[in-house]
């Protein structure tokens, strides 16, 4: 038997993938286990195994359809077990009634590229991928940029409380190398969080014209 | 500039059904929901369903689910609400909306039907 | 069902005041709740989504907040095209339900 307190987290990208992670504290490492997924008003069901992520956790992706398509809807409710394989028969580790779209974590953004750089700003761009049309615009972003002998993490926070797809970086420093994240979540769902960070993406501001006032 | 354009006023007899049509314009209606909501004179807002374009599904209230059709023709960017078994209580104004499925953007100018015999 | 409570069910206001109008719901519905504004012989007009955040295009007059399952309207300084009827609604469980309304009027 497993002991130990177990911890049961899943996410929905809001279109047709939901990414569940299972801790559990003394579980055997060489365990077979799933996480199985029952809407309650869909004739579809769908399972992914498990696979170790740390010393005691697993993941796995509940792939529910094409990227793109809308496989749960604002008023599903899914079941999700996480079933373990002790000898010859499955155990019932967690369950919970899962509510996708108060669950949410979209994908990161996409196809960054500057759109234009000066000395001291730049414009970025961005795509959300894999997001319902049921968000509309509300949408908001948080956005990053590494200055050099800085971290990730020191990088002061830029929010955009709306769905723009696009900032215009102030106040940089002329022929300097830098790079920009770009993360996203909607507004709705009690449960919901940031997406994760972007790809980051490095450019470099013009250098300063010789002989002027900069 | 988003718009939703309602059919005009009904005047029904009990037992009878009405369809309501709402034109939509400036967004792409193939991605959208389009809500139904009654109001009847003096009473509150009642939400009766939506249809999801995209997903091609639609959702009803429990009060409503077993008299009302809502569909869409995607061709002309046109949603419908059809009420059949009407009665007096019908008598409202019907309002169809855009939105997500959780509040209403974006509201038609209401469709008046009036239920006598 | 969830049933939406609007109180008081008339207000009596003087332009230039502040008005705050309630809204509870029967049971938690987390932030999933929403305003709107009706004046005679329109359509509602959505202000207010989960809770507090504004939809542009709303005076910065117009807040929300939330206590529990309690929320609250509040226009800081009544202007003349504020007296209206405002709804709230929840979208945490299916159906979606509206309050019965609160009639906002001049005092």
């Known amino acids: 038997a497993v002991n130990g307190t177990s911890r049961f987290t899943c996410f929905y990208n809001s279109r047709a993938n939901i990414s569940c992670v299972w801790s559990q504290d003394g579980a055997l490492q060489d365990t077979s286990c799933q996480v199985h997924a029952w809407p309650d008003r869909r004739r579809w069901n769908q399972t992914c195994e498990l696979l170790p992520v740390s010393q005691a956790s697993w993941a796995c992706n509940l792939i529910l359809g094409t990227p793109d398509s809308q496989k749960l809807t604002a008023v599903d409710i899914v079941t999700l077990r996480v079933m373990c394989r002790e000898g010859v028969r499955w155990r019932m580790m967690a369950i919970q009634d899962f509510k996708p779209f108060e669950n949410l974590r979209l994908m990161a953004p996409i196809s960054l590229q500057v759109v234009h750089v000066e000395t001291h700003r730049c414009n970025i761009s961005w795509k959300i991928s894999q997001a319902s049309h049921y968000f509309e615009r509300h949408l908001e972003f948080e956005a990053r940029t590494l200055s050099p002998g800085h971290t990730w993490e020191e990088a002061p926070l830029m929010t955009l409380k709306q769905k723009q797809e696009w900032i215009c970086l102030e106040t940089l420093t002329p022929d300097t190398q830098y790079e920009f994240q770009v993360r996203v979540k909607p507004l709705q769902g009690e449960f919901t969080t940031w997406s994760p960070w972007s790809q980051p993406l490095a450019f470099r501001t013009k250098p300063a014209a010789l002989g002027k006032d900069t | 500039e988003v718009q939703l354009v309602q059919s005009g006023a009904e005047v029904k007899k009990p037992g009878a059904t009405v369809k309501i049509s709402c034109k939509v314009s400036?967004?792409?209606?193939?991605?959208?929901?389009i809500h139904w909501v009654q109001q009847a004179p003096g009473k509150g807002l009642e939400w009766m369903g939506w249809i999801d374009n995209e997903a091609g599904e639609t959702e009803y209230a429990p009060g409503f689910q077993d008299r009302v059709t809502i569909t869409a023709d995607t061709s002309t960017d046109t949603a419908y609400m059809e009420l059949s078994s009407l009665r007096s209580e019908d008598t409202a104004v019907y309002y169809c909306?855009?939105?997500?499925?959780?509040?209403?953007?974006?509201w038609g100018q209401g469709t008046t039907v009036t239920v006598s015999s | 069902e969830i049933v939406m409570t609007q109180s008081p069910a008339t207000l009596s206001v003087s332009p230039g005041e502040r008005a705050t109008l309630s809204c509870r719901a029967s049971?938690?519905?987390?932030?999933?709740l929403h305003w709107y504004q009706q004046k005679p012989g329109q359509a509602p007009r959505l202000l207010i989504i989960?809770?507090?955040q504004s939809i542009s295009g709303i005076p910065a007059r117009f807040s929300g907040s939330r206590s529990g399952t309690e929320f609250t309207l509040t226009i800081s300084s009544l202007q003349s095209e504020d007296f209206a009827v405002y709804f709230c609604q929840q979208s945490n469980n299916f159906p979606y339900t509206f309050g019965q309304g609160t009639k906002l009027e001049i005092k």
């Open positions: 400036g967004f792409n209606f193939k991605y959208s929901l």
């Open positions: 909306a855009r939105g997500g499925p959780w509040f209403l953007s974006y």
């Open positions: 989960y809770g507090l």
């Open positions: 049971q938690i519905i987390s932030n999933n």
